[in-house]
């Protein structure tokens, strides 16, 4: 293990929407911060195979798969995707690490799959495996929240059975009429599922996820029924 190179695999998300197929590049576009992909030696594999965390992206998203290699001397490399070889141009960063990148622009179904990077260094040969899939947003749902009283406690739980899991917040207002609009200073927001203190004339629970936001108002009659 000590003789193996230190490999770091990262994912870079891009904000732009340029149309292109996957291409090997040493100069990724302007982008968000790199996200570590936890590259580790694949258990019980023949040869030295590193694997990166499975990557799931939205249709049309642009990403870069990047590998940083801390190994002495020069490296040569080759990307393989669906039996096609793609050219590979490693460069070296300021810490003298070899950097290899694969840019996938405007993600489509045809670009999903396994990306294999073969690297040859002066010390050893190894393979890095990336699995890229498209996020299935057809399964996404956003349901209106409902309330449940917590057992043995004077508290209310707000539940929204949505996918992906929503962020739940209580919106509490202490005065009547127009001033209970969300931007009003009379409105208090608590981003939590459990509400221990019930106060205000207008109590709502809201759930939000990628599909939007849904709210349910709590009426006094609900307190007796939850």
């Amino acid at each position: 293990n000590q003789d193996l190179p230190v490999i770091k695999c990262v994912l870079i998300n891009h904000k732009n929407n340029d149309s292109s197929v996957g291409k090997s590049s040493s100069y990724p576009m302007v982008s968000e911060s790199p996200e570590d992909l936890g590259c580790a030696l694949r258990p019980q594999s023949s040869g030295t195979v590193y694997e990166a965390a499975a990557v799931e992206v939205d249709v049309s998203a642009s990403i870069t798969l990047q590998v940083l290699v801390d190994a002495p001397g020069n490296i040569s490399c080759l990307w393989v995707f669906k039996h096609s070889s793609l050219n590979c141009q490693p460069h070296f960063d300021l810490q003298n690490r070899g950097v290899v990148s694969m840019v996938i622009l405007k993600m489509t179904e045809t670009q999903a799959g396994e990306y294999l990077l073969f690297i040859q260094s002066e010390a050893t040969n190894y393979t890095i495996l990336f699995t890229v899939s498209i996020r299935n947003t057809l399964l996404y749902t956003l349901r209106r929240p409902y309330f449940r009283k917590m057992e043995n406690q004077d508290a209310l739980v707000c539940i929204s059975e949505s996918v992906p899991e929503p962020i739940v917040e209580w919106v509490l207002c202490d005065s009547q009429g127009e001033s209970c609009k969300e931007e009003s200073p009379a409105v208090v927001k608590k981003e939590e599922k459990v509400l221990h203190e019930l106060f205000g004339t207008d109590i709502r629970c809201c759930a939000r996820n990628e599909l939007g936001r849904e709210c349910t108002r709590l009426f006094t009659i609900d307190l007796n029924q939850t």
Partner: antibody, heavy 124, light 107 residues
Framework: QVTLKESGPVLVKPTETLTLTCTVS??????????VNWIRQPPGKALEWLAH???????SYSTSLKSRLTISKDISKSQVVLTMTNMDPVDTATYYC????????????????WGQGTLVTVSS | AIQMTQSPSSLSASVGDRVTITCRAS??????LGWYQQKPGKAPKLLIY???SLQSGVPSRFSGSGSGTDFTLTISSLQPEDFATYYC?????????FGQGTKVEIK
């Protein structure tokens, strides 16, 4: 650089609800199959696994504590929140969060990075 | 829940010794087992994953073996920095469970 940091109250009264937050950086739940474990360790005792949540919202809880635990995540804040109801002095422990990495070929790596832990004391 | 039984619960050894710690699962867990090292006041550190794979940056004197119900962590030549408590963790079945720990002390 990957980091995880636990935060929450140092002191909790019996019967109260504990809310702990694990704030992560250097990775996200957005596009990679990542997860977070919560683990605790009472003073001088062994580690105990509490719960986990994955980027796809798959979650699981310790059998003995399931009725008291809720785990959730907020992708926009890079946070995982664990709530534990009806706290008791026996829940006094150091609470840790640790990363889980899920791989396309079906295996996973547990705890390649950990937070430094936060000591929670339950006392009236 | 799957019970993980570690043995011994503590051991005394000298620098240079070969140390073996075992972990037994109450049912088969294939190779879904990790080994962790913890020093007082510190968070645990991953040493071995998938029963026998060495985590990046961990010295090669640490090795793991086993499959099914019986697993072993071996330190081939104990170093001063290895005096700590070691835990196994199974992630084959929910709930995931730790062993009770093995404290390695200086003889």
């Amino acid at each position: 650089q990957v980091t995880l940091k636990e935060s929450g109250p140092v002191l909790v009264k019996p019967t109260e609800t504990l809310t702990l937050t694990c704030t992560v950086s250097g990775f996200s739940f957005n596009n990679a199959r990542m997860g977070v474990n919560w683990i605790r360790q009472p003073p001088g005792k062994a580690l105990e696994w509490l719960a986990h949540i994955f980027s796809n919202d798959e979650k699981s809880y310790s059998t003995s504590l399931k009725s008291r635990l809720t785990i959730s995540k907020d992708i926009s804040k890079s946070q995982v929140v664990l709530t534990m109801t009806n706290m008791d002095p026996v829940d006094t422990a150091t609470y840790y969060c640790a990363r889980i990495v899920g791989y396309g070929s079906g295996w996973r790596l547990l705890g390649d990075y950990w937070g430094q832990g936060t000591l929670v004391t339950v006392s009236s | 829940a799957i019970q993980m039984t570690q043995s011994p619960s503590s051991l005394s050894a000298s620098v240079g010794d070969r140390v073996t710690i075992t972990c037994r699962a109450s049912q088969g867990i294939t190779n879904d087992l990790g080994w962790y090292q913890q020093k007082p006041g510190k968070a645990p550190k991953l040493l071995i994953y998938a029963a026998s794979s060495l985590q990046s940056g961990v010295p090669s004197r640490f090795s793991g073996s086993g499959s099914g119900t019986d697993f072993t962590l071996t330190i081939s030549s104990l170093q001063p920095e290895d005096f700590a408590t070691y835990y196994c963790l199974q992630d084959y079945n929910y709930p995931w469970t730790f062993g009770q720990g093995t404290k390695v002390e200086i003889k």
